[in-house]
Every structure is written in structure tokens, then in C-alpha cells.
């Protein structure tokens, strides 16, 4: 049957008594029992006495009386009585406990740390107890954080418990520092101090500060340095494991660097003298801090003697492209110890030849690759102390994307005009590595008469590849290729001869090699108008006759054709538009705008100009005709000048009669 819990003579969960009084506490139970007492009471051999006796009806119960003479404030705590031996089926120990406050007005706190603060270890996010328990439950305690904060209990995150102190349910960085519990009793202020110390188990980083893998000659000394970086309040254990550990071959030195204001750096340096073949293998540095663990390892290789092997990484002939930001020329090298590296270009030290050449390990880096970087590159490897030398040569070809010479030197802002029926020679000169091939294409203009400009890709008509026998577009006399030396370079010149210029369009030459393709568009506009712009006067009229002027412009080069009359008013030349483009006649190659003034009078004399806008430059062009209506006194020829709108105008023929301007 289940034993009844032991019974204490003082009832309830807590009891308050005054310091200096004697505590009498009896425990009565159905079996032998023992006392569990506050730590300071257990140490009291003089004041404390426990007497055991048989009690109860027929003396069948077990009694134990605890007497504590002149009880002190620091005897405050839990007093419990529990059965000594409980049947194994009973998992829970049967006990009764009471918390006894031993009140002392001169000592409100059970433990006082008024001079040197007590260190409390804390972990962020975990419960933190500031153990300023009191000798009476009625004492009001305030928790302060240096310098000015008061941590006020809110019943939830911060709870006050007179038996434990302040319980902070999830401590934060705000609780790190000097915390003080304060109590005022009878007008007297008492303080007990605690210093919270956040001990972390964070390992920020672990490194072995030696190259990986480690290579050594037999008989040399191995030194491995393991570095662990942690936050300031972390301590670590560092251990090594290595191949010949059983023979304790290594000596290990440890040190800590606390000069950094943000972190601790722990060092563990492993040293093995006179390395042998048995010492080769994996060396591991293990770092532990509480539950945190990190490790790092490195392989150690032992060599009997110095050696160099060198091979081509890919093939012996390498290719790159001019204009590349950087090109790495590298060889596959295995060597020990590290050899000295020199690169030669065409037999001369490369890095001395150009600042664009840099040595990185067993590689040569060429910055901003140019054509001149092509050549033979040799790597020289030497371990002088061991008299070991090796070299290997690779050939670098620098390919160059094609360039068309005429594209670079062309200074024509407008497309050229080709007279109708003329023979024309078109040339494209290209350079590249490898030598580019040049092909010619024809892109016809859309022969819609309203179309004023022919652009490449301006319509859906495709481009046609050309050869000497092509019947696309204009008749071709020949297409020839020849080598030409221009600016000291071998260039490929391709010439296309147009036998009979009849159809407007675009000739395209395309130069290509394995690196890329470049094209040049040659606008081939046929004109049946001299210079692409022509003004014609049928005859200079006499008074009463009709004035007939015509203006013909190349339709691919000009638009917005208008006749204007220039008049001077108050020393300013005014332009009066006297016709519209709508009246123009569009033909295969040109646009003609006729101007007819019927039954002219002397007042119709003046400067007549045909104005058109250059399709490509947007510039307005004027072609002027001085018209003098012949009366009795003036029979001069008209003076014809082709000028831009920006040039000044002059009147070359005046009549002797009154002409209105």
C-alpha cells in the first residue's frame, strides 16, 4: 500500500520567524526518513540537532525533530523531510517541504555580495535567475542595471520570487553587465551585486594556416598552426590527431591572443622534427566549446628528393582573340619544393618585354591581348639548390576579328550618287587572322515610287549573294580578290565592277573568319540628274508669256521639294513657298517639281529657288534661278547658283522698270 507523505509540524508552504529564535521542526512518517536542509544549515554542527524517536499510536510511526538554535538569516530556505527507502515500484520520492524565512531587519538578503559582485553565467534566450532571495517575503526588492536602468518585474518576462530572486524568462544582451538588487528596510538601503557573464559556445572560424596539401622533404621539420577565432566570452579545447599519434611524435604549443577587442584568437602549433614516410597522411585540428565543434584538416606529403614535371595543359598550340581583357597561358606543373618560374616570349623574358605580362604561379597572364602577343612562349622551371631544371614551349596564335579598311577611312556623310549607265568600281579591303574571306551581296531598293529613301532592311526584300555571273540588280563585269599591303599589313582587297549602273540598291561586302564577321553597306543610288539636283528654265520669258521652271532631284537623296520665291523686305530675305511636293512627279530615279507662272509681268522678276531636304543630313539645299522678265530695257541672261540655305543671296539681274520686292 502507498505510504502517506511525511507530515511536518509547521503547516503550509512557508513560515516566517525572527533571526535569533530557535527553530523547532518535527517530521512524522510511516517509515524512516531523512532531512534535506539549506546549505548553510547543513554546515552548522553546533547549533543544529536532530533527534529521532518512535512516536504515534503504539510507537509505530517514525518521528524526527530538528532543532536549530539562534537561527540566522542565511539559514533561510527549504526544509524537507523524505523517506529513506521507498519500494522500487514507487518512482517518486515521498517528501514534505516547507520554506522558512528567517527574518533579520539588518539583513534583508540571504546572500550578500556588497563588495565583490557574484558572477552569474548566462545564455541569451535562456532563463536567468538573479538569486537575491530575501529573508522575509514582505521585502520589496528593486533590480537595477548599471548605470541607470531599473529592470521592473512585469510578471512574465521578469518575475519576482522572494524564495529565488528575480527570474528573467529569456535573457537578452540587455541583462549583460552589473545588476544590483536593492531593498530598503527601516530607512536603510541594502544592496547585493551580481555580474552577469555571457558565456557563448560559438566558434567563428578554424583554420590551418599552411598551404594545402603540405609538402615536405624527408628529414625536414613540420610546423602546423591551427587558429580558432571565437567571441570574447568563449573558451575552447584544441586537439590534434595525426598519423603517428601513438608514438607521440608531435609537440604542441598553445597560446591565446586577446588583443583584439572583438574576438579571441586561440593558437595551437603542432611541430614534428625530422619527418619520415610514416608521418605522411591526414593531420586534423579539432576545436570544441561546450556543444559546439569544428575541425579542419590538411594532408601532409613526404618526398625523398626534389623533382619537377611539366606538361601542356591542353595542346601545344594555343589560340586566343585580340581584344580579350586577359588570357592565361598555363602549364601543368608538379614540383617540390616550389621551383623558380621564368616565362620567355620568343626567347626573351616576357615580363621585361611588356608590362601587360604577369606571372601568377605556373601561369603567364597576358592583359589586353593584341596581335603582337602571338609567338612562342617557354616556361623555365628551376630548383637551383637541387640542380633540377625543366622547360616547355607552347605556341600562341592570336586571332583577329575582320576589319574593313574603307569603313574606318570613309568620310562621306551622304551616300554617293552614281550616274545612270555608268561603269563603277566598288572595293572592300579587309584584314583579320586567319585571312578573312570576302563575299558580296545585293539588297535592292523597294521600287515603290513613293519611297524616298532606300535603307538596308527597310523592307522585306532579301539580300542576294553575288558572283560575276549574277543577274540580280546591275550587270556585273567582274569580282576579283587580291592581296594588298596597307599600313604594313597584308590585307585582302575585293573589287566588284558594275558594268552598267541602272538599279538603285545597297551593295554589301561581308568579311568573315573563324573569329567573327564584319560588313560594309555601300548605298548605290542611281541618278539621272547631274549632281542629283538640277533646276531647268525652258526659256527666259518676256512679259505676257508663261514662266516654266522645273526642279529635278535624286529621289534617294532628297525629299520635301518646294519652289520658293525670295523677296527682300526691310533688308530681310523672306521665303515665300509657291508650290507643294504634292504636285511633284516621281520617276524611277528622281522627283521633278514643275513651276508654271502664266502670263508673267515685270513684277514676277526675282530669285526663284528650288528647295529640297537631304534625307541623310537633314540639311536644306537651295538651287536658285534669277528670273528677269524681259521688257524693252533688260535682256540679261539668268545667273544660276547652287547654294545652301545658310549662304547669303544676291540679285544678279535687275530690270530698269519698277519691280516690287
Amino acid at each position: 500500500s502507498k505510504l502517506k507523505d511525511p507530515e511536518l509540524s509547521l503547516k503550509g508552504t512557508q513560515h516566517i520567524m525572527q533571526a535569533g529564535q530557535t527553530l523547532h521542526l518535527q517530521c512524522r512518517g510511516e517509515a524512516a526518513h531523512k532531512w534535506s536542509l539549506p546549505e548553510m544549515v547543513s554546515k552548522e554542527s553546533e547549533r543544529l540537532s536532530i533527534t529521532k524517536s518512535a512516536c504515534g499510536r503504539n510507537g509505530k510511526q517514525f518521528c524526527s525533530t530538528l532543532t536549530l538554535n539562534t537561527a540566522q538569516a542565511n539559514h533561510t530556505g527549504f526544509y524537507s523531510c523524505k523517506y529513506l527507502a521507498v519500494p522500487t515500484s514507487k518512482k517518486k520520492e515521498t517528501e514534505s517541504a516547507i520554506y522558512i524565512f528567517i527574518s533579520d531587519t539588518g539583513r534583508p538578503f540571504v546572500e550578500m555580495y556588497s563588495e565583490i559582485p557574484e558572477i552569474i553565467h548566462m545564455t541569451e534566450g535562456r532563463e536567468l535567475v538573479i538569486p537575491c532571495r530575501v529573508t522575509s517575503p514582505n521585502i520589496t526588492v528593486t533590480l537595477k542595471k548599471f548605470p541607470l536602468d531599473t529592470l521592473i518585474p512585469d510578471g512574465k518576462r521578469i518575475i519576482w520570487d522572494s524564495r529565488k530572486g528575480f527570474i528573467i524568462s529569456n535573457a537578452t544582451y540587455k541583462e549583460i553587465g552589473l545588476l544590483t538588487c536593492e531593498a530598503t528596510v527601516n530607512g536603510h538601503l541594502y544592496k547585493t551585486n551580481y555580474l552577469t557573464h555571457r558565456q557563448t559556445n560559438t566558434i567563428i572560424d578554424v583554420q590551418i594556416s599552411t598551404p594545402r596539401p603540405v609538402k615536405l622533404l624527408r628529414g625536414h621539420t613540420l610546423v602546423l598552426n591551427c587558429t580558432a577565432t571565437t567571441p570574447l566570452n568563449t573558451r575552447v579545447q584544441m586537439t590534434w590527431s595525426y598519423p603517428d599519434e601513438k608514438n607521440k611524435r608531435a609537440s604542441v604549443r598553445r597560446r591565446i591572443d586577446q588583443s583584439n577587442s572583438h574576438a579571441n584568437i586561440f593558437y595551437s602549433v603542432l611541430t614534428i622534427d625530422k619527418m619520415q614516410n610514416k608521418d605522411k597522411g591526414l593531420y586534423t585540428c579539432r576545436v570544441r566549446s561546450g556543444p559546439s565543434f569544428k575541425s579542419v584538416n590538411t594532408s601532409v606529403h613526404i618526398y625523398d628528393k626534389a623533382f619537377i614535371t611539366v606538361k601542356h595543359r591542353k595542346q601545344q598550340v594555343l589560340e586566343t582573340v585580340a581584344g580579350k581583357r586577359s588570357y592565361r597561358l598555363s602549364m601543368k606543373v608538379k614540383a617540390f619544393p616550389s621551383p623558380e618560374v621564368v616565362w620567355l616570349k620568343d626567347g626573351l623574358p616576357a615580363t621585361e618585354k611588356s608590362a601587360r605580362y604577369l606571372t601568377r604561379g605556373y601561369s603567364l597572364i597576358i592583359k589586353d591581348v593584341t596581335e603582337e602577343d602571338a609567338g612562342n612562349y617557354t616556361i623555365l622551371l628551376s630548383i637551383k639548390q637541387s640542380n633540377v631544371f625543366k622547360n616547355l614551349t607552347a605556341t600562341l596564335i592570336v586571332n583577329v576579328k575582320p576589319q574593313i579598311y574603307e569603313k574606318a577611312v570613309s568620310s562621306f556623310p551622304d551616300p554617293a550618287l552614281y550616274p545612270l549607265g555608268s561603269r563603277q568600281i566598288l572595293t572592300c579591303t579587309a584584314y583579320g587572322i586567319p585571312q578573312p574571306t570576302i563575299k558580296w551581296f545585293w539588297h535592292p531598293c523597294n521600287h515603290n515610287h513613293s519611297e524616298a529613301r532606300c535603307d538596308f532592311c527597310s523592307n522585306n526584300e532579301e539580300s542576294f549573294i553575288l558572283d560575276a555571273d549574277s543577274n540580280m540588280g546591275n550587270r556585273i563585269e567582274s569580282i576579283t580578290q587580291r592581296m594588298a599591303i596597307i599600313e604594313g599589313k597584308n590585307k585582302m582587297a575585293s573589287t566588284l565592277v558594275v558594268a552598267d549602273s541602272r538599279i538603285s540598291g545597297i551593295y554589301i561586302c561581308i568579311a568573315s573568319n573563324k573569329v567573327g564577321t564584319v560588313g560594309r553597306n555601300i548605298s548605290f543610288y542611281i541618278t539621272d540628274v547631274p549632281n542629283g539636283f538640277h533646276v531647268n528654265l525652258e526659256k527666259m520669258p518676256t512679259e505676257g508669256e508663261d514662266l516654266k521652271l522645273s526642279c529635278t532631284v535624286n529621289k534617294f537623296l532628297y525629299r520635301d521639294v518646294t519652289w520658293i520665291l525670295l523677296r527682300t523686305v526691310n533688308n530681310r530675305t523672306m521665303h515665300y513657298s509657291i508650290s507643294k511636293q504634292k504636285m511633284a512627279i516621281t520617276k524611277e530615279h528622281s522627283i521633278t517639281l514643275n513651276l508654271t507662272i502664266m502670263n508673267v509681268s515685270l513684277q514676277d522678276s526675282g530669285t526663284y529657288a528650288c528647295r529640297a531636304r537631304n534625307v541623310y543630313t537633314g540639311e536644306e539645299i537651295l538651287q536658285k534661278k534669277e528670273i528677269t522678265i524681259r521688257g524693252e530695257h533688260c535682256n540679261k541672261k539668268a545667273v544660276f547658283s547652287r547654294i545652301s540655305k545658310f549662304k547669303s543671296t544676291r540679285n544678279d539681274c535687275t530690270t530698269q522698270s519698277n519691280v516690287k520686292h
Epitope: 514582505n138 520589496t140 528593486t142 541607470l148 521592473i152 518585474p153 510578471g155 512574465k156 518575475i159 522572494s162
Partner: antibody, heavy 121, light 112 residues
Framework: QVQLQQPGAELVKPGASVKLFCKAS????????IYWMRQRPGKGLEWIGE????????TFNEKFKTKATLTVDKSSSTAYMQLSSLTSEDSAVYYC??????????????WGQGTSVTVSS | DIVMTQAAFSNPVTLGTSASISCRSS???????????LYWYLQKPGQSPQLLIY???NLASGVPDRFSSSGSGTDFTLRISRVEAEDVGVYYC?????????FGEGTKLEIK
């Protein structure tokens, strides 16, 4: 003994602001939170927010975040609550209260008499 | 926000008999630390509210032991074992498990 003094009434115009005070005495002002509560006529209580007088830290009910500003003057042991952009909806009795959270042994809180704020033109 | 629900009026009680007032929360007020964050306040006519019960079952300082409280995580009852004339007023339940603190609308204790 612990006391929280509040003025009896304030009459303010719509759109204006009012600054209510709560003068504490009989205890160490910085050792306890000050809470502010609102009670509209015939209605229940609403918690506006709290201030820790030792460092001025405040926590608000989202509903009052733009309405109320809590401050303290440690030298005079006085807590203040400023209410801005007042409307007739803000007419209520405003209480300051000092709770003391002692979880196992005793717990006592103290309330001011409340300030009746009337918003009227 | 946690919603606290109360009846507006209690059943009228005779002086000297016991009375019960109920309150329900929209969420359990039991914290992982074992404390239930429920409070009972009494507001007597023309006075400021006063605390009766804190953390569900603890009697506030100076409150007569005629008052007691019990409940689960969401349903709570305030009991007055022998009602006296001075117990008349509006009883509010409140929670501070989560911000903001929220109060019930109050239950008026009526005497027969």
C-alpha cells in the same frame, strides 16, 4: 503611502492636444511601471500603453500609437500623456496606474482618480 | 488582439449568499512558465478600478478572502462566498499574456 494624483477634468476643442499628468508619491518613482488606461462613458477599460520611468522605454497598444505620447519627469516624479488631434471619440476618463508584479508573495496596484477629458467646441 | 468576453449582468444575489461571475478568453492565457495571465478588477460606483485577483488565482494584497478565482486556460470564474453590500460594482476580467492588455466589457453585480 503610495499616491497617484491626477487633475479632475480637462475641456479641449476638437483638433487640439492635451497633456495629462500623473504625479506619483510615497514610493521610488523609477522602480515601477506607469500604465495608462482609458474608460469611455459606460464602456470597459482600454490599455493605452506603459512607460518605464527609469529609462523612458515605452510600449503602446497599436490603436493609440499615433494618438498618445508617454513621457516622464524623474525630478518631479511625474508621468505625462499627451493626446493629439482630439475628436469627440477621445472623450473619456484617463487613468494612470502603478502595478507591482510580485508573483508569489503579494501583488498590489494603485490607480489615480482619473482625468475626465471632454472634447467639445 | 485577445478578446475577453463577459455577460453584462450577473444573476441578482441576496446579501450573505455566494455569487459567480464568468469570463472567457479567445485564446488560452496559460504561459509556458505555468502562470495563467488572467486578472479580475472591481470598479465601485464613482471610483477607480481596484485589483482583486492576479494571475488567475492569487488574491491581491488587502483583498478579503471571500473572493476566489479558478479556471482553465480560456474559461474563468470569480466567486464571492458571502456577498456584502460593499461588493456592488462592475467586475472586469483582463489579460496581459499578450500586448495589448485587453479587458472584458464588465459584469455588473446586482443585489436582490
Amino acid at each position: 503611502q503610495v499616491q497617484l494624483q491626477q487633475p479632475g477634468a480637462e475641456l479641449v476643442k476638437p483638433g487640439a492636444s492635451v497633456k495629462l499628468f500623473c504625479k506619483a508619491s510615497g514610493y521610488t518613482f523609477t522602480n515601477y511601471y506607469i500604465y495608462w488606461m482609458r474608460q469611455r462613458p459606460g464602456k470597459g477599460l482600454e490599455w493605452i500603453g506603459e512607460i518605464n520611468p527609469s529609462n523612458g522605454d515605452t510600449t503602446f497598444n497599436e490603436k493609440f500609437k499615433t494618438k498618445a505620447t508617454l513621457t516622464v519627469d524623474k525630478s518631479s516624479s511625474t508621468a505625462y500623456m499627451q493626446l493629439s488631434s482630439l475628436t469627440s471619440e477621445d472623450s473619456a476618463v484617463y487613468y494612470c496606474t502603478r502595478p507591482s508584479f510580485y508573483s508569489y508573495d503579494y501583488y498590489k496596484d494603485y490607480w489615480g482618480q482619473g482625468t475626465s477629458v471632454t472634447v467639445s467646441s | 488582439d485577445i478578446v475577453m468576453t463577459q455577460a453584462a449582468f450577473s444573476n441578482p444575489v441576496t446579501l450573505g449568499t455566494s455569487a459567480s461571475i464568468s469570463c472567457r478568453s479567445s485564446k488560452s492565457l496559460l504561459h509556458s512558465n505555468g502562470i495563467t495571465y488572467l486578472y479580475w478588477y472591481l470598479q465601485k460606483p464613482g471610483q477607480s478600478p481596484q485589483l482583486l485577483i492576479y494571475q488567475m488565482s492569487n488574491l491581491a494584497s488587502g483583498v478579503p478572502d471571500r473572493f476566489s478565482s479558478s479556471g482553465s486556460g480560456t474559461d474563468f470564474t470569480l466567486r464571492i462566498s458571502r456577498v456584502e453590500a460593499e461588493d456592488v460594482g462592475v467586475y472586469y476580467c483582463a489579460q496581459n499574456l499578450e500586448l495589448p492588455w485587453t479587458f472584458g466589457e464588465g459584469t455588473k453585480l446586482e443585489i436582490k
